[in-house]
């Protein structure tokens, strides 16, 4: 029987979770890294949200003071790693370079839609989350995780795949987004920036966080990933923002301390099993959810993104280790491995809590509140 994660669970590794109050718009730091010249070509020319102000229209807001504690995310959707939408959902039998969905990179040729046409789809990820426009859905219950606390043996494979650092997860990690919405975890990976430059994939009101973790899951309705790709709800990703805090995060340190061993692109090592849930925020009840895509080729749509409102805290040294240790293709550092945010194109981001109810300066303006689409779930 699955038990929901209890609110009284201890915060991950040494007080690494964010505070319990959601991040209000007035608490958001200003976005300083936009536009990004590193964003993959072929994406920045996509149409933006015509009915929403652009980042340049957002008022600058001052960050929280240190004594107020860590930021919390109110709406963040997360992204995913690549796979192949055809029969072998991976790279098997993809022998022509033009067809090879591993043959892509951040910020360079080939344009992603040429690698996979789905990358030019209308419902892509990541997105910018605007809590004021999120639809509060009381039907969105706390996430349930089972089997995420792994013993040290068997060890797990940690690999620098040239696009991210990826931990392959064993069978048996079960996650439920709600009744009848059950998934099995496959892998987790991270997205990050560079020195002084944030690298989360999702943004909140234009604010980009230092890094982001994605735990990728396959629906139990599908036996194979290639069957699930592109099918609504076939894949689900749990995403959480990582930001700087005063203490070392002991859970993350179990992975970060091994990055030097896999500095080279394509290298791998074995790490003892660990508590995967400790890499996520402790509050499983407050999150944003929307339907999007993988954030890398093949960019398959139908992916359910669940972005935690609470952030995870890592020390400055840990964030530096993450962004400054690994090497990617072409003897270049593996940095800034995030995709540009994509237009919502009419999608509604749902929230499991009343994220849009706040007293921000813009609350005086008329805001069209979106209705919850999941009321019947």
């Amino acid at each position: 029987q699955r038990l929901p994660r209890m609110q009284e669970d201890s915060p991950l590794g040494g007080g690494s979770s964010g505070e319990d109050d959601p991040l209000g718009e007035e608490d958001l730091p200003s976005e300083e890294d936009s536009p990004r010249e590193e964003d993959p070509p072929g994406e920045e020319d996509l149409p933006g949200e015509e009915d929403l102000p652009g980042e340049e229209d957002l008022p600058e807001v001052k960050p929280k003071s240190e004594e107020e504690g860590s930021l919390k995310l109110e709406d963040l959707p997360t992204v995913e790693a690549p796979g192949d939408p055809q029969e072998p959902q991976n790279n098997a039998h993809r022998d022509k370079e033009g067809d090879d969905q591993s043959h892509w990179r951040y910020g360079g040729d080939p344009p992603w839609p040429r690698v996979s046409p789905a990358c030019a789809g209308r419902f892509q990820s990541p997105v910018d989350i605007r809590p004021q426009l999120a639809a509060f859905c009381p039907a969105l219950r706390p996430l349930e995780l089972l089997g995420f606390q792994l013993p040290p043996l068997p060890e797990l494979r940690l690999r620098n795949n040239g696009h991210s650092v990826q931990l392959t997860l064993p069978p048996g990690l079960e996650m439920a987004l709600g009744p009848g919405r059950e998934y099995r975890a496959l892998q987790l990976h991270l997205h990050w920036g560079a020195a002084g430059r944030p690298g989360s994939e999702h943004t909140v009101e234009g604010h980009r966080f230092p890094a982001e973790i994605h735990v990728v899951h396959l629906s139990t309705a599908f036996a194979r990933v290639d069957e699930a790709l592109g099918r609504p709800g076939g894949l689900a990703v749990l995403a959480a923002f990582l930001e700087e805090g005063p203490e070392e995060n002991s859970a993350y340190e179990q992975l970060l301390s091994r990055l030097e061993e896999i500095a080279e692109e394509g290298s791998e090592t074995q790490v003892p099993g660990l508590d995967i849930s400790a890499l996520l925020p402790s509050d499983f009840s407050r999150y944003f959810q929307y339907e999007g895509s993988l954030t890398t080729p093949p960019c398959a749509q139908g992916v359910i993104w669940t972005v935690f409102n609470q952030t995870v805290m890592l020390s400055a040294k840990q964030l530096h280790t993450l962004s400054d240790t690994l090497w990617g293709p072409g003897d270049s550092r593996l940095q800034l491995n995030f995709r540009a945010t994509q237009p919502l194109n009419g999608r509604v981001i749902e929230a499991s809590f009343p994220a849009g109810v706040d007293s921000s300066p813009r609350a005086a303006e008329p805001v069209q509140l979106n209705s919850c689409l999941a009321a019947g779930d």
Epitope: G83, K96, H103, P154, N161, P170, L186, G266
Partner: antibody, heavy 124, light 106 residues
């Protein structure tokens, strides 16, 4: 369709270095997501993984052979090579090169395709 | 190192028989298993990967299952071309193969 072909001497003297090359055709060895591997099979026995190389030059070896093994890659020739030093009769085997496929989405991996194999005999 | 033990080491069967081969890991493996078929004088050919995924072009009479330490390859209805040696392989800790199971004509 990618094909692999092993080449090298079929006879090596004890204490010498065994050298084999695998030529890849029908695809680029520089495509990410693939790990170029060597596997051997002693006569009438099972399969033993030797190690792999990524196009970037990153290698990963079987711990039991690590001290004697070097795998290298020449992307300009679309080839990768195996060197096994200080060989003995116990190294007599059919040596296969194979491509290890890596599914970046799931982390799953497996060997396909394989070369046809080349028999290397260690004898004086 | 993780050891992979296959059983039986050989099996005699007839065309149309259901054949089951098991593979046991010396410790639980966190990644997933692959199965290969090898015929005399030929290179191995992948049948199943990630425990249960059928490789493209492989007949559906082959199936795989299992998790943790115990894995199974099943041939639902043995065909003449299926007489061969079968190997399991794990990629959890480096890469290791089972010792093989020979499927012979009864």
């Amino acid at each position: 369709q990618v094909q692999l072909q092993e080449s090298g001497p079929g006879l090596v003297k004890p204490s010498q270095t065994l050298s084999l090359t695998c030529t890849v055709s029908g695809g680029s060895i520089s495509s990410g997501g693939y790990y170029w591997s060597w596997i051997r099979q002693h006569p009438g026995k099972g399969l033993e993984w030797i190690g792999y190389i990524y196009y970037s030059g990153s290698t990963y070896y079987n711990p039991s052979l690590k001290s004697r093994v070097t795998i290298s890659v020449d992307t300009s020739k679309n080839q990768f090579s195996l060197k096994l030093s200080s060989v003995t009769a116990a190294d007599t085997a059919v040596y296969y090169c194979a491509r290890e496929n890596y599914d970046i989405l799931t982390g799953f991996n497996w060997f396909d395709p394989w070369g046809q194999g080349t028999l290397v005999t260690v004898s004086s | 190192d993780i050891q992979m033990t296959q059983s039986p080491s050989s099996v005699s069967a007839s065309v149309g028989d259901r054949v089951t081969i098991t593979c046991r890991a010396s410790q639980g493996i966190s990644s997933w298993l692959a199965w290969y078929q090898q015929k005399p004088g030929k290179a191995p050919k992948v049948l199943i990967y990630s425990t249960s995924r059928l490789q493209s072009g492989v007949p559906s009479r082959f199936s795989g299952s299992g998790s943790g330490t115990d894995f199974t390859l099943t041939i639902s209805s043995l065909q003449p071309e299926d007489f061969a040696t079968y190997y399991c392989q794990q990629a959890d800790s480096f890469r290791t193969f089972g010792q093989g199971t020979k499927v012979e004509i009864k």
